[in-house]
């Protein structure tokens, strides 16, 4: 077990803070909830603190919760491939570009680390080149979320990881908005981190609303499990 992994044996409170600017539309989001890495479970509620969110909530899911991949459940035989927990408590910087097909792109930079007993994800997001009446600024996405696989590989040069995946957002007309994600994570501290073999995270997310919440918000329930690396030969012959 890495030292960082010991911090995730129980339920951990999570705080998410985002400052965004998409095509000049500025906004802030605050999120709170908890994670339980034993089950790969996240429960979070996000509120736009600046009024109405200028982009659809589903386009921010990867920035919020796929940002705290340290809550992914890594099975026992894969624990040596869990970069995310091994970087804690000092944490990691997570940088992404999200390319939306036939539309603009988001660039994000986040610091994910422990502040006291709370896992904090502080994010800056900049979006450019979006069409004012496109699927994103035109709010044409359905309020739901598909399952995805998130592919992880070691980046030995930067002592971190690279992560690629393609998100499929459902559009109200029945079509799909594709969003290609390119991510890199580098540790904040200078302690040792686990550099993984290639594998993936399997994610399932459910979006809902709080009937008592008047502000623009999103409630998120998510389960994330690491997969893609088989047991070693010694395990097979036990």
């Amino acid at each position: 077990m890495s030292k960082g992994e010991e911090l995730f044996t129980g339920v951990v409170p999570i705080l998410v803070e985002l400052d965004g600017d998409v095509n000049g539309h500025k906004f802030s989001v605050s999120g709170e909830g908890e994670g339980d890495a034993t089950y790969g479970k996240l429960t979070l509620k996000f509120i736009c603190t600046t009024g109405k969110l200028p982009v659809p909530w589903p386009t921010l899911v990867t920035t919020f919760s796929y940002g705290v991949q340290c809550f992914s459940r890594y099975p026992d035989h894969m624990k040596q491939h869990d970069f995310f927990k091994s970087a804690m408590p000092e944490g990691y910087v997570q940088e992404r570009t999200i390319f939306f097909k036939d539309d603009g792109n988001y660039k994000t930079r986040a610091e994910v680390k422990f502040e006291g007993d709370t896992l904090v994800n502080r994010i800056e997001l900049k979006g450019i080149d979006f069409k004012e009446d496109g699927n994103i600024l035109g709010h044409k996405l359905e309020y739901n979320y598909n399952s995805h696989n998130v592919y992880i590989m070691a980046d030995k040069q930067k002592n971190g990881i690279k992560v690629n995946f393609k998100i499929r957002h459902n559009i109200e007309d029945g079509s799909v908005q594709l969003a290609d994600h390119y991510q890199q994570n580098t540790p904040i501290g200078d302690g040792p981190v686990l550099l993984p073999d290639n594998h993936y995270l399997s994610t399932q997310s459910a979006l809902s609303k709080d009937p008592n919440e008047k502000r623009d918000h999103m409630v998120l329930l998510e389960f994330v499990t690491a997969a893609g690396i088989t047991h070693g030969m010694d395990e097979l012959y036990k």
Partner: nanobody, 117 residues
Framework: ESGGGSVQAGGSLKLSCAAS???????MGWFRQAPGKEREGVAS????????YYTDSVKGRFTISQDNAKNTIYLQMNSLKPEDTARYYC????????????????WGQGTQVTVSS
């Protein structure tokens, strides 16, 4: 890289870059270096969907494009100015830190562009 040359102000040139497997990436960019100056990013393209980015000084004048079948990136330069004089390079870009963070510590020979007034 190829396609450079000498041209009068207001003229046009089209640069091309055949990206070999070694330096190829899903994101590619054009960079330039004028004598005595730092190398700077000019334009970048995401090859998956064709998303593009331009530095302010070339917006509306330069166009980056691609031919996926030929694994080639182009830079169409119109309304050239003397301040565009530089050696131009194409390079693989780190998509996560798009538009101008290089993927590899490697530069090609580049192609010289000279714009006279």
């Amino acid at each position: 890289e190829s396609g450079g040359g000498s041209v009068q102000a207001g003229g046009s040139l089209k640069l091309s870059c055949a990206a070999s497997g070694y330096i190829s990436s899903n994101c590619m960019g054009w960079f330039r270096q004028a004598p005595g100056k730092e190398r700077e990013g000019v334009a970048s393209i995401y090859r998956g969907y064709g998303n593009t980015y331009y530095t302010d000084s070339v917006k509306g004048r330069f166009t980056i494009s691609q031919d996926n079948a030929k694994n080639t990136i182009y830079l169409q330069m119109n309304s050239l100015k003397p301040e565009d004089t530089a050696r131009y390079y194409c390079a693989a870009v780190n998509c996560a830190r798009w538009p101008f963070d290089r993927e590899y510590n490697y530069w090609g020979q580049g192609t010289q562009v000279t714009v006279s007034s």
